[in-house]
Each structure stands twice: as structure tokens, then as C-alpha cells.
Interface confidence: low
């Protein structure tokens, strides 16, 4: 497989350290949809990793969106993270699995799980793809180490693990990681695959920045963003190079790179972009 | 235990209209999308569409479209589709059921339409 | 949209015989899907995404493939078995179902 030997690439093992978001929408880009008002908002800047100020229309947009800066805080920032990591390692279900199965308001119905409250289990659900709750689980070991009770009534003992926010998943606690990457290749690899609004199911592919790897996506047709490739080749080609050792404070290992497009700076230890 | 209960069998007229009722229990109604399949003659399966009951979206096979109407009933968990300026060429079964972008787990158990004057 | 070509039409086998058939696309798919129907019932999913089974499909059947080719395996052929079989893609609009291989029991 082709991208098994762009694997290897990169000089060391060393992944990608996540980029933990309170939520996956923190990492959609402003939008002031189609409408016209002029209305003060907040949004999450994943590359600045500040709340900041922008002008809505009034009407559609996303779910980055807030009516004041606390509230962007409140969603987007670590801080908050930190709050229900330290319920979960307190051995208590987080509110939101208490929270009714959502499949959001998009159309790319993609298998999940989320714990069923009446039934005290983790069950199946399709997820649309976009918005819904935190209720929503990649895995069904996911779920149950996060929501379901251990076998004797208390939940499933997650120590030293930390919640990954950003799809509910556990990573190891001891994850900062000195910032050993740069990203030379096009900014547009760093953005979350993006479905767009036809209704076509094209196969696509994207570059998923969090484990560094082109994966499929189901492409609707019209829309969507840049991160957007025919082929998995195509992808790797134009994003997969784009990352950089660095090994000193001047000295850059090449890793390949057949692109010097714009230079996109950032330090991976505190920022990912979710695979949506 | 999901369960999908379509409405029973009908006999049209060419040119007239008919809706199909499918009762939806046993899991969140909203939470799946509900999707169309005709089988004529015993033997091609064709998918006509779906419909998100979450809010309503519809997604159509091209060959379908102002042909069928989908709509739902949230409150009654209940998804009906209606179909058009009938002909003997839409004579067939028609399945809903429950499912996703990429596959259908579970089936109505169908309701024959005959168009015939 | 895709087209779905599954061969044999019709098949017959034996209880306890390996039964193969198989389903080529017009391009390539992500995954397939297949369905089990017998005269008179409604199709009833039997593995997913390529692979998987179902709730309740017994064991001895399994999916494989990828690309553009892919197949339906029954390990030991057992007269409950006897059906009209299908596959299905959506990995591009609109979902498209196969035309059915039919198994009979011999």
C-alpha cells in the first residue's frame, strides 16, 4: 500500500500531538452566512487558539459561533477540558452521557455509539456528521470507558488516561510534546474534511492532520474546502510532505518535501484538527 | 425490537395518486434516516430515496424524482411516501427502510402497489 | 451511478458445500453490502461493510473484497440457506443494488 511506505517519511515514530478541542465544531472556520446583519459574534481561531470577534449575518453559519467571549472560552478552551477530564478520572459519568442520542442536522450518516441512559449500555447510532452532542463515541470501547459502569457498579477506571475532547476518545496523560514539527505545505491540509451541501456521495480523500495519514471521505458533490483530493496519491502528494522534523533550533530535516508553498507555522503541542 | 409496519396492498388507477404508510418502533425515529426501495417483479431492487426525519431532508435517485414525495410524522414515527401520475410500469413492491448513507438494516415488510385500469 | 454485476444469475448446491458468488462493480466501492431474501419475505441485511455480519447471520457466512471486486462466501451450504442473495453500494450516489445471484438447493 502507498501510504504504508510514505510512512516512513518522516524521520522518527514520533505522532502528531493532538490538537484537544472542547468540541469538533471549534474547529470550523467563521462563518457569517448568506444573510446580511450585522451582529457581534465570537468563533474559536484554531490557529491563533484565542476566541475572537466577527461579524454574523444573522442567519444559518455553524456551531463556532458564540454570543459572547466567556461562552467561546467556556466551549473551545483547555480549561474547560481539564473540568471534565478531572470528573472522568473522579470515576463519575460526564454530563453529556446522560445527554439523548443526536444525530445532528447533516446528511453523511456514519456509524457511532453513545450510551443509552434507559438501558445503561453503549449502543449504535447513525451520526450526521456534523453538530449533535458529545454523546457520540468513533468506538464502542470509547463509549463504554467513558459512560458505561465497570463491572462493579463504579465506572471503568481511567486513570492516567485524559479525554480527548475533540471525539471523546482516551490518549495517555503525559502528553506534552516540545513541538517538533513545522508545516511547509499548503494550510488547506490542516482544515477538516468537509462533505459540502449537494447530495452526491463522490469518493474523496483528505488529509487527516491528527494521525498524519489521506483517509476516505464521502464528498456531496459542491462546496466544501480545499482538503479535497481524487486520489489517495494526489493527497499524500500534496499534504503528507508538507511536515518538517525540526531536530535543533535552526536545523530542519527535509522529509521529502517536494512543495515550498506558503509557510504555516504551528506548534502542534496544544492544537489538532478533529477528523469530521 | 425495531419494526417497520407498512400499510397494505393498493390497486390504482393509471394516472392517480397513492401514499404509503410506514410505522416506525422499537428505536429513536430520528435518529436513522428512512429509505425507499421498489422491487418489480419479484426480482430488481431499486432505491428511490431517503429521508432524514430529523429534519426533514430529502436525498433522491435521480430516476425517482417528481415521481415520489417523501415526508414524515415525527410525531408518530411514521414515514410515507407518495407516489405520482401512476402507470402500470410502477407496479411493484415498495420496502421502507431504516438505514444510513451506506447500507439499509431493516426492511418493511412491503406494500404491492398495482397500477391497472 | 455504479453498476453492480453479480455472477452466477442462478446457482445450486449441496447441503454442506462451499458456495461462492461474486459481485464486480463498475468502479470502485469502499464497501459492499449484501442482502439475503427468500420468496415472499423482505431482504434482510446479512454482512456489512464488506465484512461484517449482521446481528444473528450464522457464522458461516462471510464478505470479502475490495475495489472493484468482492464476494459472498457460505462455508457449508444448509438448505435454510436457499435464497436470492444481493449486493449494494452507496460509496457513490445513488446506492445501487446487484441484479441477485439465486441460490437453490440441489
Known amino acids: 500500500d502507498s501510504e504504508e511506505d510514505e510512512e516512513h517519511t518522516i524521520i522518527t515514530d514520533t505522532e502528531l500531538p493532538p490538537l484537544k478541542l472542547m468540541h469538533s465544531f471549534c474547529a470550523f472556520k467563521a462563518d457569517d452566512g448568506p444573510c446580511k446583519a450585522i451582529m457581534k459574534r465570537f468563533f474559536f481561531n484554531i490557529f491563533t487558539r484565542q476566541c475572537e470577534e466577527f461579524i454574523y449575518g444573522g442567519c444559518e453559519g455553524n456551531q463556532n459561533r458564540f454570543e459572547s467571549l466567556e461562552e467561546c472560552k467556556k466551549m473551545c478552551t483547555r480549561d474547560n477540558a481539564n473540568r471534565i477530564i478531572k470528573t472522568t478520572l473522579q470515576q463519575e459519568k460526564p454530563d453529556f452521557c446522560f445527554l439523548e442520542e443526536d444525530p445532528g442536522i447533516c446528511r453523511g450518516y456514519i456509524t457511532r455509539y453513545f450510551y443509552n441512559n434507559q438501558t445503561k449500555q453503549c449502543e449504535r447510532f447513525k451520526y450526521g456528521g456534523c453538530l449533535g452532542n458529545m454523546n457520540n463515541f468513533e468506538t464502542l470501547e470509547e463509549c463504554k470507558n467513558i459512560c458505561e459502569d465497570g463491572p462493579n457498579g463504579f465506572q471503568v477506571d481511567n486513570y492516567g488516561t485524559q479525554l480527548n475532547a475533540v471525539n471523546n476518545s482516551l490518549t495517555p496523560q503525559s502528553t506534552k510534546v516540545p513541538s517538533l514539527f513545522e508545516f511547509h505545505g499548503p494550510s488547506w491540509c490542516l482544515t477538516p474534511a468537509d462533505r459540502g451541501l449537494c447530495r452526491a456521495n463522490e469518493n474523496r480523500f483528505y488529509y487527516n492532520s491528527v494521525i498524519g495519514k489521506c483517509r476516505p471521505f464521502k464528498y456531496s458533490g459542491c462546496g466544501g474546502n480545499e482538503n479535497n483530493f481524487t486520489s489517495k496519491q494526489e493527497c499524500l502528494r500534496a499534504c503528507k510532505k508538507g511536515f518538517i522534523q525540526r531536530i535543533s533550533k535552526g536545523g530542519l530535516i527535509k522529509t521529502k518535501r517536494k512543495r515550498k508553498k506558503q509557510r504555516v507555522k504551528i506548534a502542534y503541542e496544544e492544537i489538532f484538527v478533529k477528523n469530521m | 425490537e425495531v419494526q417497520l409496519q407498512q400499510s397494505g396492498p393498493e390497486l390504482v388507477k393509471p394516472g392517480a395518486s397513492m401514499k404509503i404508510s410506514c410505522k416506525a418502533s422499537?428505536?429513536?425515529?430520528?435518529?436513522?434516516?428512512m429509505n425507499w426501495v421498489r422491487q418489480s417483479h419479484g426480482k430488481n431492487l431499486e432505491w428511490i430515496g431517503l429521508?432524514?426525519?430529523?429534519?426533514?431532508?430529502?436525498t433522491f435517485n435521480q430516476k425517482f424524482k417528481g415521481k415520489a414525495t417523501l415526508t414524515v410524522d415525527k410525531s408518530s414515527s411514521t414515514a410515507y411516501m407518495e407516489l405520482l401520475s401512476l402507470t402500470s410500469e410502477d407496479s411493484a413492491v415498495y420496502y421502507c427502510a431504516r438505514g444510513t448513507y451506506e447500507y439499509v438494516d431493516y426492511w418493511g415488510q412491503g406494500t404491492t402497489l398495482t397500477v391497472s385500469s | 451511478q455504479i453498476v453492480l454485476t453479480q455472477s452466477p444469475t442462478i446457482m445450486s448446491a449441496s447441503p454442506g458445500e462451499r458456495v461462492t458468488m461474486t459481485c464486480s462493480a463498475s468502479?470502485?466501492?469502499?464497501?459492499m453490502h449484501w442482502y439475503q431474501q427468500k420468496p415472499g419475505s423482505s431482504p434482510r441485511l446479512l454482512i456489512y461493510?464488506?465484512?461484517i455480519l449482521s446481528s444473528g447471520v450464522p457464522v458461516r457466512f462471510s464478505g470479502s473484497g475490495s475495489g472493484t471486486s468482492y464476494s459472498l462466501t457460505i462455508r457449508r451450504m444448509e438448505a435454510e440457506d436457499a435464497a436470492t442473495y444481493y449486493c449494494?453500494?452507496?460509496?457513490?450516489?445513488?446506492?445501487?443494488f446487484g441484479a441477485g445471484t439465486k441460490l437453490e438447493l440441489k
Open positions: 429521508i432524514n426525519p430529523y429534519n426533514g431532508d430529502t
Open positions: 422499537g428505536y429513536s425515529f430520528t435518529g436513522y434516516p
Open positions: 468502479s470502485s466501492v469502499f464497501y
Open positions: 461493510d464488506t465484512s
Open positions: 449494494q453500494q452507496w460509496s457513490s450516489y445513488p446506492l445501487t
